[in-house]
Interface confidence: low
């Protein structure tokens, strides 16, 4: 509309008692330069006098007279486009409507700006993303609808009352569109931050507390689990019973399913927090863990290595090498599955015990023909003695002996 003066400034400005207010403002007059400027507080138009009544905070005419008591109010504008104002300090009773009465040679205009001054520093506002998940970086934003050149402030982040180590980026805006101070903090919350209190604290230049806002973190995370086993060392004998218990130390949201895994494979029909293994066999040795899921995903406990101890199984003998040439060396190895490992071995040659041979390996450095035959062994551990297996045959090759001609 070409019949109007054009102004741009924030609609409402916020401050508190004793602070200041900086009002960014631009204008375009209908004709020529500004000749007179009066800043009113709560102006009202008087039809009788065809003038505005109200407290005059600032007055600037062609004569350049400024009321001496209003030094706290400054007009920082010019005669054709800038109408920026500063009030320092600002008082509670400055709240209300500011009226900018502008006059050029032929035209007049009253522009209104709202000023909201609170008794005490008002709190900033923390903005969080709609959902926070563990280990995913989020930006926490603290916004304060205040900024003024004459009143420096700072925003500080606290976690459970302790300053946060992460570097925050503070920005200010003092434009015709908006006036604010904003602090942004990039943060990768862990599950343990769930339920913790984050505070954005408004401080003055000296670090003195002015106000704050707090939020409670709602960190979505997979279930966090603890596994307990009886007996605690997870070492049992064949035939014993084992109980494993899965405890959920934290889950957000609630957990929905429970399962048990052995060596990475899910155990069928085991969907409770307790795993009872009765009369265990050696095949049940392995790594066990529990897995509990919620809407975020599955959580796994640490692994428990279950060792089922048993007496040695029937042993087998491995010969390196058969057939053997007379004079060569041969090694015999007694192999028997056992837990714990066998500590003692008994060796047999053609059914007769070989005295002094108690090791897993028997080494014969120089084979003679009489060494040929069947070798077997018996393994022994703390749980008992195994059975003698079928044994292995040593064949000794040698050149003709005692040649006789017929």
């Amino acid at each position: 509309d070409s019949s109007k003066w054009v102004f741009e400034h924030p609609e409402t400005l916020y401050a508190w008692e004793g602070a200041c207010v900086w009002i960014p403002c631009t204008y375009r007059a209908l004709d020529g330069d500004l000749e007179s400027f009066i800043l009113f507080h709560n102006p009202e138009y008087n039809k009788n006098t065809s003038k505005f009544d109200g407290t005059r905070l600032y007055e600037s005419t062609k004569d350049g007279k400024v009321p001496s008591e209003q030094k706290r109010v400054q007009f920082l504008g010019d005669k054709n486009k800038n109408c920026t104002l500063s009030i320092h300090p600002v008082h509670l009773n400055d709240s209300g409507q500011l009226g900018l009465r502008m006059e050029s040679k032929t035209e007049k205009w009253m522009e209104r700006i709202h000023l909201n001054v609170s008794e005490r520093p008002f709190p900033p506002h923390i903005q969080l993303p709609p959902e926070i998940q563990e280990s995913q970086e989020v930006t926490l934003t603290c916004l304060l609808n205040f900024s003024c050149y004459g009143y420096p402030i700072q925003l500080q982040w606290l976690l459970e009352g302790v300053p946060m180590r992460q570097a925050a980026v503070t920005s200010t805006s003092l434009t015709i569109k908006s006036v604010f101070t904003r602090s942004e903090l990039k943060f990768s919350p862990q599950w343990s931050h769930h339920g913790k209190i984050v505070t954005c604290q408004l401080q003055d230049a000296d670090g003195k507390f002015l106000s704050n806002d707090t939020v409670q973190l709602n960190v979505k995370h997979t279930p966090k689990l603890e596994i307990k086993v009886t007996p605690s060392d997870a070492i049992v004998r064949e035939g014993d019973s084992v109980t494993m218990t899965c405890e959920v130390s934290s889950s957000n949201p609630e957990y929905t399913t429970v399962s048990w895994l052995k060596d990475g494979t899910s155990l069928k029909k085991q969907n409770t927090f307790t795993l009872n293994l009765r009369e265990v066999t050696k095949d049940q040795s392995g790594k066990y863990c529990c897995q509990v899921s919620n809407d975020v995903g599955p959580g796994r406990s640490e692994e428990v290595f279950l060792q089922v101890q048993y007496a040695p199984e029937p042993s087998t003998v491995q010969i390196l090498h058969s057939p053997a040439v007379e004079g060569s060396q041969v090694e015999f190895l007694c192999m028997s599955l056992a837990n714990p490992l066998p500590t003692n071995y008994t060796w047999y040659h053609n059914g007769k015990e070989m005295q002094g041979r108690t090791e897993e390996k028997v080494h014969i450095p120089k084979i003679l023909p009489w060494h040929a035959g069947t070798y077997s062994c018996v393994a022994e551990n703390i749980l008992g003695t195994g059975q003698r297996g079928p044994g292995a045959e040593l064949d000794v090759q040698y050149p003709p002996k005692k040649v006789t001609t017929v």
């Epitope: 769930h194 339920g195 409670q216 709602n218 966090k224 959920v248 130390s249 934290s250 889950s251 957000n252």
Partner: nanobody, 125 residues
Amino acid sequence: QVQLVESGGGLVQAGGSLRLACAASGDTVSIYYMGWFRQAPGKEREFVGALSASGQFTDHADSVKGRFTISRDDAQNTVFLHMNDLKPEDTAVYYCAVQRYGWVYRTDKTMYNYWGQGTQVTVSS
């Protein structure tokens, strides 16, 4: 904001039963977990039991397991604490509370955002 009002307290003989009720109003949609706590004279406020938002999970303090149970009436926005086989040591002011931040904090009184004013339960021997 959530408002909580407890009722149902009173004087009962040892071995008797009571049913406490906690009626929630206000922003009840955002309630996640409801807990019952109690405070005996000169003692700290202690966890009694909790109920999850879905109603799927309940938890009780060891001292009341097998005697106290928690249930809810969604239509009435009410949670109940059923107390059987009451003992003189159960004498306390019973409070209901709500928190929004996860089952992990069900026993931690500091995590509860809103509290009722409490109802007195006295068990005489």
